[in-house]
């Protein structure tokens, strides 16, 4: 069974561990970190806040940020549910994923195409990322049109979630 | 190498296992469970049915439900492809993810904004969840407007999928 | 602890390994493979090209294809950001995921509902797949309306990503 001796594989022979099985086990990618947070009830700025009583394991939450505690490759996904009372003109909904306050990825969708007088329009927007993150890296979400995120009707629908895919020990 | 001794990490020293390496291996998060099911050809109710000849490993399928066999933290994702023959009014498409018959998360999108007489409108809707699930937990999907899920032209596009991220043995 | 002796679980007793701990470790699902590629700046055909200087680990990139190097169950996800200058008629945006040049899954959404003269419409489309892939399997993405993928305004938004969930050694 040929397992290439890359950083994420167990060095079964040689390396620092050689035949030391406890050492081998220590080097194995057993570590798991994850988070699943729902948006806070009352939003008052473009940077979204989250309920810190969600699922948090090996990750911290602080001031609207998820803060990484273990380095590695993370899968990050955010999903938002919008409810727009259509004005006269079209509306561009935008979701920005920020890493250390820098925009890493965004998703945009246009609703209320011009002239449409509908009572309301629902729109769902999601965004994902697969990225190496270091300790103390912050993850946050920005939404210009945060007033359209319906936290009362849909308190469970707006979430930010991450999980560690491969640790870099 | 500081690996915190949390439930999902291998207790390399102490605990029940101590230096017993077979025990340590048993406690390691090797278990994998997953499913990837396509929607059934003929839908006749709001609770969607699935083709049980899809990918199923460590998960059971029964009466429209995925049934958990191993406890742990699961990533759940559902994606649906809609085809709507627009009526005079707008249509709200809704996808509900249910855990043990309780709505856990939903996604909504409005199509056919009022007055638009188009032959047809395509819409794609997805929903994800990261959650701890116990043995015998059921996962199901509800769609009020199931008649708009085009299972004939797009039989492969409507799927429910899960995978175990971290087991809780 | 009852771990079923299936291909993705470690046979803690019996099998080829029995009590041989190094063998057991070799059989454990430690292998990790992943990719996260952004779309190439200049698109000139319906089969999308990707920046090969993205994240690639245990996967090759060649001629618009991700090429699998280790067999197993992969999670595949693609997300595209469209910007459409609306013509007189509606536009169907389609994203196809191809495995070995066969259509495996597609996502469609209609924008610019008839008669709407908007300056521009944003739309975001994603598609995922969980599938067993063999060595040398190719993964590619096809978009008929590739001219609407805005690679200049949104160079980071259009991505193809995969990760190995369970290897089949």
């Amino acid at each position: 069974d040929s397992i290439p001796n890359s950083p994420d594989n167990v060095p079964l022979k040689g390396g620092d561990c050689s035949e030391d099985l406890l050492c081998i086990l220590k080097r194995a990618p057993f570590k798991k970190s994850w988070a699943y947070l729902q948006v806070a009830k009352h939003l008052d700025k473009t940077k979204l806040s989250w309920n810190k009583d969600g699922i948090l394991h090996g990750v911290r939450y602080q001031d609207g940020n998820l803060v990484i505690q273990f380095p590695g490759l993370y899968f990050i996904i955010c999903q938002l549910q919008f409810l727009v009372q259509c004005p006269q003109n079209s509306v561009d909904l935008k979701l920005e994923l920020l890493i250390n306050k820098h925009i890493k990825k965004q998703a945009l969708v246009t609703v209320c195409e011009s002239g449409m007088q509908t009572k309301h329009v629902y729109q769902n927007l999601s965004q994902f990322l697969l990225d190496y993150l270091q300790v103390d890296t912050t993850i946050s979400v920005n939404v210009d049109t945060f007033q359209y995120i319906d936290t009362s009707t849909f308190p469970l629908e707006n979430v930010l979630s991450i999980f560690l895919y491969s640790n870099s020990d | 190498d500081s690996i915190p001794n949390s439930p999902d990490n291998v207790p390399l020293k102490g605990g029940d296992c101590s230096e017993d390496l077979l025990c340590i291996l048993k406690r390691a998060p090797f278990k994998k469970s997953w499913a990837y099911l396509q929607v059934a050809k003929h839908l006749d109710k709001t609770k969607l049915s699935w083709n049980k000849d899809g990918i199923l490993h460590g998960v059971r399928y029964q009466d429209g439900n995925l049934v958990i066999q191993f406890p742990g933290l699961y990533f759940i994702i559902c994606q649906l492809q809609f085809l709507v023959q627009c009526p005079q009014n707008s249509v709200d498409l809704k996808l509900e993810l249910l855990i043990n018959k309780h709505i856990k998360k939903q996604a909504l999108v409005t199509v056919c904004e009022s007055g638009m007489q188009t032959k047809h409108v395509y819409q794609n809707l997805s929903q994800f969840l990261l959650d701890y699930l116990q043995v015998d937990t059921t996962i199901s999907v509800n769609v009020d407007t199931f008649q708009y899920i085009d299972t004939s032209t797009f039989p492969l596009e409507n799927v429910l999928s899960i995978f175990l991220y971290s087991n809780s043995d | 602890d009852s771990i079923p002796n299936s291909p993705d679980n470690v046979p803690l007793k019996g099998g080829d390994c029995s009590e041989d701990l190094l063998c057991i470790l070799k059989r454990a699902p430690f292998k990790k493979s992943w990719a996260y590629l952004q779309v190439a700046k200049h698109l000139d055909k319906t089969k999308l090209s990707w920046n090969k200087d993205g994240i690639l680990h245990g996967v090759r990139y060649q001629d618009g294809n991700l090429v699998i190097q280790f067999p197993g169950l992969y999670f595949i996800i693609c997300q595209l950001q469209f910007l459409v200058q609306c013509p007189q008629n509606s536009v169907d945006l389609k994203l196809e995921l191809l495995i070995n040049k066969h259509i495996k899954k597609q996502a469609l959404v209609t924008v610019c509902e008839s008669g709407m003269q908007t300056k521009h419409v944003y739309q975001n489309l994603s598609q995922f797949l969980l599938d067993y892939l063999q060595v040398d399997t190719t993964i590619s993405v096809n978009v008929d309306t590739f001219q609407y993928i805005d690679t200049s305004t949104f160079p980071l938004e259009n991505v193809l990503s995969i990760f190995l969930y369970s290897n089949s050694d």
């Epitope: - | 085809l83 085009d150 004939s152 | 089969k47 978009v143």
Partner: antibody
């Protein structure tokens, strides 16, 4: 054994609309794509378009502005309308069945059943 | 959409093998493994001979085989017989969910 039979006028005046119907017998019209293909005398085949029983259509881009297809599952029939015809539309018109199966992936089995063809002449 | 390119004619003697090429673009033949081949005798409807590049419908002789490389597909007929004399058309699925035919190749059995 599925059989297809084209019907419609053999002569159409320029600028008018060509209308053809295909009747499916010996099998169900459901779960297939139904296709129209034409062949001018002494020339090659030209794909016009297809319709699924759900009503989804795909048309040849060069003919799209003039083509309309419809399906009537209750009568086991599907139809072609081609507007603003000219002499260049003179051809043998075939209706045909295309089989596509979605299983582990999409399998395209090609056009496996054909009608015998009907000649349409565009002339004043 | 432009027609796929086929040679106007090919010929071969009984028992020989011949190959007909079909060249398309990166949006049809080069994109998918969805290429079909049809045989048409004079005053008859076409008949499906190959689907998905190299698969034969039941009832079609195994003397007919297909392949695909890059933007070009090929039909090979081995052990040529008199009844193989006909017109042959390739067809490919395209990125716009349509089909496109080749211009056709007249096969003459000498």
């Amino acid at each position: 054994q599925v059989q297809l039979q084209e019907s419609g006028p053999g002569l159409v005046k320029p600028s008018e609309t060509l209308s053809l119907t295909c009747t499916v017998s010996g099998g169900s019209i459901s779960s297939y794509y139904w296709t129209w293909i034409r062949q001018p005398a002494g020339k090659g085949l030209e794909w016009i378009g297809r319709i699924y029983t759900s009503g989804i259509t795909n048309y040849n881009p060069s003919l799209k502005s003039r083509v309309t297809m419809s399906v009537d599952t209750s009568k086991n029939q599907f139809s072609l309308k081609l507007s603003s015809v000219t002499a260049a539309d003179t051809a043998v018109y075939y209706c045909a069945r295309e089989r596509v199966v979605g299983a582990s992936r999409y399998y395209y089995y090609g056009v496996d059943v054909w009608g015998q063809g009907t000649t349409v002449t565009v002339s004043s | 959409q432009s027609a796929l390119t086929q040679p106007a004619s090919v010929s071969g003697s009984p028992g020989q093998s011949i190959t007909i090429s079909c060249t398309g673009t990166s949006s049809d033949v080069g994109l998918y493994n969805y290429v079909s081949w049809y045989q048409q005798h004079p005053d008859k409807a076409p008949k499906l001979m190959i689907f998905e590049v190299n698969n034969r419908p039941s009832g079609v002789s195994n003397r007919f085989s297909g392949s695909n490389s890059g933007n070009t597909a090929s039909l090979t007929i081995s052990g040529l017989q008199a009844e193989d004399e006909a017109d042959y058309y390739c067809s490919s699925y395209t990125s716009s969910s349509t089909w496109v035919f080749g211009g056709g190749t007249k096969l003459t059995v000498l």
